[in-house]
């Protein structure tokens, strides 16, 4: 499989980490999360095309079958392969609390 | 979250399980596996509208991203949330051994 | 630059009370959360507490329920706590913190020493 | 609440050492673990936050890891201006509480 940087389609076009400024405002968390008031979203994008970051056996399969049945067999899709943990502050009907999230920012990314 | 029956898109048109056949030669595996001959191979296939069988928060927040940014951010993906285990018999210098892939068939699927 | 200055140094009888400042500059003060952090002479950091200054919304460390109050002023970008019935044991220099991600302290003012003596 | 043990509560070494100071939990706190850095008369400062995620403005020779309940903040290779007290800090859950530190002193 080509590493993360060999992207066969140009710099940066391949499934890679990518980072969103998103207000609470944004994520629709206004009326639960008080803090932090804006989170450096990382996330997966980009596209997957033969072998790149294949995570499994199952992503080269989805690979081969897309190449014969592309109307019918979705390319890999870039996803994170695991993720940062996150605090947040949130409101609750006693006050506030805080909450810790282990599943909510990309840490690295692979195509599936 | 909507149930993974409940799609909003029309009856199977949202993520789910697809069972595709498909020969070894159709999976490029013609030159090193001897069985089986022929593979139900079982994919995630299908659309991921807002909130359909969300992996995790990751899987939210996307879909908030998605739909102030559509251009920037790409709509989740249906994926394996887990797989079903599978024996392959392979050629080998020696003559052939039996190996088991973990990784190789979707069991069932989410949006992420 | 973020910056917290806080108030000089005060010098109380045990059993008074004191009001310690911190003013938030080069940002937007309701941007960042406040936390108030203690720390005794050769000893280790004790949180005492954390502020939201949009609306002033606190959460105590339970050791410091009572001892502490914890208030903000919007106007004047400060932060303030108020230190009730000291004692000796109140004698420390305190921190003010700003956090932009409510997990760690990224921002710290210099402290204010705080002497509890008759 | 959580404690937090910190070890060794001194540490003399030789700029150019390769160091490695301990932060023990109480019980598992994944990745809730942020690192210190305080000198004499100064405030701290935030050096490693989330067990092992680097800081900007912070040297490369600081690093981080460890998750659950063992935690290590490493310098591999000991400069002059980094003599002073380390300091562990949990978020895992309120209330936010510290190590007793780590003097980092020379030998």
């Known amino acids: 499989a080509r590493n993360g940087d060999d992207c066969p389609l140009g710099p940066g076009r391949c499934c890679r980490l990518h980072t969103v400024r998103a207000s609470l405002e944004d994520l629709g968390w206004a009326d639960w999360v008080l803090s932090p008031r804006e989170v450096q979203v990382t996330m997966c994008i980009g596209a997957c095309p033969s072998q790149f970051r294949a995570a499994n056996m199952h992503a080269q399969i989805k690979t081969s079958l897309h190449r014969l049945k592309p109307d019918t067999v979705p390319a890999p899709c870039c996803v994170p392969a695991s993720y940062n943990p996150m605090v947040l502050i949130q409101k609750t009907d006693t006050g506030v609390s805080l909450q810790t999230y282990d599943d909510l920012l990309a840490k690295d990314c692979h195509c599936i | 979250a909507r149930n993974g029956d409940d799609c909003p898109l029309g009856p199977g048109r949202c993520c789910r399980l697809h069972t595709v056949r498909a020969s070894l030669e159709d999976l490029g595996w013609a030159d090193w596996v001897l069985s089986p001959r022929e593979v139900q191979v079982t994919m995630c296939i299908g659309a991921c509208p807002s909130q359909f069988r969300a992996a995790n928060m990751h899987a939210q927040i996307k879909t908030s991203l998605h739909r102030l940014k559509p251009d920037t951010v790409p709509a989740p993906c249906c994926v394996p949330a887990s797989y079903n285990p599978m024996v392959l018999i392979q050629k080998t210098d020696t003559g052939v051994s039996l190996q088991t892939y973990d990784d190789l068939l979707a069991k069932d699927c989410h949006c992420i | 630059q973020v910056q917290l200055q806080q108030s000089g140094p005060e010098l109380v009888k045990p059993g008074a009370s004191v009001k310690l400042s911190c003013k938030a500059s080069?940002?937007?003060?309701?941007?960042?959360?406040i936390n108030w952090v203690k720390q005794r002479p050769g000893q280790g950091l004790e949180w005492i507490g954390w502020i939201y200054p949009r609306d002033g919304i606190s959460k105590y460390n339970e050791k410091f329920e009572g001892k502490a109050t914890l208030t903000v002023d919007t106007s004047s970008s400060t932060a303030y706590m108020e230190l009730h019935s000291l004692t000796s044991e109140d004698s420390a220099v305190y921190f003010c913190a700003g956090t932009s991600d409510p997990a760690y302290f990224d921002y710290w003012g210099q402290g204010t020493t705080l002497t509890v003596s008759s | 609440d959580i404690v937090l043990t910190q070890s060794p509560a001194t540490l003399s070494v030789t700029p150019g050492d390769r160091v490695s100071l301990s932060c023990r939990a109480s019980?598992?706190?994944?990745?809730?673990l942020h690192w210190y850095q305080q000198k004499s008369h100064e405030s701290p400062r935030l050096l490693i936050k989330y067990a092992s995620q680097s800081i900007s403005g912070i040297p490369s020779r600081f690093s981080g890891s460890g998750s659950g309940t063992d935690f290590t903040l490493s310098i591999n290779s000991v400069e002059t201006e980094d003599f002073g007290m380390y300091f562990c800090q949990q978020s895992n859950s309120w209330p936010y509480t510290f190590g007793g530190g780590t003097k980092l002193e020379i030998k």
């Open positions: 019980q598992s706190i994944s990745y809730y």
């Open positions: 080069g940002y937007t003060f309701t941007s960042y959360d």
